[in-house]
């Protein structure tokens, strides 16, 4: 806490300007009016205040707004935002996308800090859902943002927001997250024609079920191996050799290099060796000729 001392004669700040950098900690506390600071917050960002001085300015705002800063102040916090704690931010009510952008800009180039995470959480909760404009903004600043959300949080993303998602935004998503996002993407892109649809849906396919993969195999999509390797193993296993060949098109040759890795390895184990041989890739490990294949899952379903 800064001691309350009287402001020396002639040092009372009439505006927030460069001269304040010469003020000692106690002089800033005594000579800068909190209300003046609040109305001229935008000026703080043009002045090289030290951390010690910024702490005093923050303390003045905290005293003026013990219940949390108003959005008019928050929008102009600039660098002072980096001195806020998550506890401070939880008191805020941020509703404007412009305010969110202004604060994310301050943290640009850095990893998502606890302050930023708290800010985003407050903003999204206030909006009730992750709308397209918000998602656009967040993924522009943090490409991995979408994949940092839980499946439960992702369920509040409306299909219309999926248009804002870029392939790189999904790079770190796990299968559980893609399971939630894929149906939304399918809905969002449903009116597109075959080739355009595939381009858009491709990065979401890690959440696709078998029947959708079968349908894609009928559309000459030529899926690349990188996409194929990200598919759900349980969705790939029921595909026939012919379906995989159609799905991959000219990329089918890449299966050889991936034969030891999932889902290719597990898929090979489920195919007849005869069928695998028709690919001419030398894939080994299929079911030998003459063996009877029992689909236990089908049996269970019938009983």
């Amino acid at each position: 806490e800064v001691e309350k001392t009287a402001c020396p004669s002639g040092k009372k700040a009439r505006e927030i300007d460069e001269s304040l950098i010469f003020y000692k900690k106690w002089e800033l506390e005594a000579c800068v009016d909190a209300a003046l600071l609040a109305t001229q917050m935008d000026r703080v960002n043009a002045i090289p205040f030290t951390y010690e001085q910024l702490d005093v300015l923050k303390h003045k705002l905290d005293e003026l707004y013990p219940q949390g800063y108003p959005e008019s102040v928050i929008q102009h916090l600039g660098y002072l935002f980096l001195k806020m704690s998550p506890e401070d931010i939880r008191k805020w009510n941020v509703t404007s996308l412009e305010t969110l952008k202004a604060l994310l800009e301050v943290n640009k180039g850095h990893e998502m800090s606890p302050q930023v995470a708290t800010l985003i959480d407050r903003f999204v909760k206030g909006r009730g859902q992750l709308d397209k404009d918000t998602l656009d903004t967040l993924t522009a600043f943090y490409p991995g943002y979408l994949c940092s959300l839980s499946p439960e949080e992702l369920s509040s993303v409306p299909p219309s927001s999926i248009w804002a998602v870029r392939p790189q935004d999904l790079d770190t998503c796990d299968p559980r997250q893609l399971d939630v996002l894929y149906p939304k993407a399918r809905l969002a892109f449903q009116n597109m024609n075959g080739s355009e649809y595939f381009v858009k849906i491709q990065s979401f396919l890690g959440g696709a079920p078998t029947e959708d993969l079968k349908a894609l195999s009928q559309q000459n999509v030529s899926m690349d191996l990188a996409t194929f390797m990200k598919l759900r193993t349980d969705a790939v296993l029921p595909l026939t050799v012919a379906e995989v060949q159609k799905l991959l098109g000219p990329h089918v040759e890449g299966l050889k290099a991936e034969e030891r890795h999932r889902p290719v390895r597990d898929w090979i184990l489920r195919q007849r060796q005869d069928d695998l041989d028709t690919l001419g890739l030398g894939l080994q490990g299929g079911i030998p000729n003459g063996y009877l294949v029992l689909d236990l899952s089908m049996q269970e379903a019938l009983s």
């Epitope: 460069e18 001269s19 900690k25 090289p48 030290t50 951390y51």
Partner: antibody, heavy 119, light 106 residues
Amino acid sequence: QVQLVESGGGLVKPGGSLRLSCAASGFTFSDYYMSWIRQAPGKGLEWVSYISSSGSTIYYADSVKGRFTISRDNAKNSLYLQMNSLRAEDTAVYYCARDLIFPVVFDYWGQGTLVTVSS
Amino acid sequence: IQLTQSPSSLSASVGDRVTITCRASQGISSALAWYQQKPGKAPKLLIYDASSLESGVPSRFSGSGSGTDFTLTISSLQPEDFATYYCQQFNSYPLTFGGGTKVEIK
């Protein structure tokens, strides 16, 4: 790219004067605070002076106060350091550096100019 | 605020892990930067805010600490890392630098 080029250094007798210049390019000079930092031979770094982007606010280290004057010409993208009443202890390489507002660090430096004060 | 660096010099080999410390005469939060200076060259900003890497600086450099004690670590020393390293505080004016640590080839 950002470039800072100092000039004006040289040999001067104690009590003499010298004017250092720093030509800036590759960035909007008028947006930045600028500093002079010096380094005596074999010694560490000492922050000498800085000037605000508009030129209205100036800071000097106690060791040079009253003897050195910092100034800038934003139209010419130039920073200056007028050094009067020079002493032997002012002998150093003088660097001009660009200041960041937050945090207050120096993100670009010139190559320096040597000032030698000796009789 | 005075900054004391230790050691003032050290000898190390390529591939070594090197640690340099900087101690402030009073608490400075995380308001510390590190610079690298090669002979006859200008200093170069490496780290600010105690641990934030300046863009373009190799990830083998890292900083830590807060309050009064700070550390610069080079995880695996490379030939181009032999230089003098300085810390600088920006918690309060006047801005001050440490005395430097010279990293030499063993």
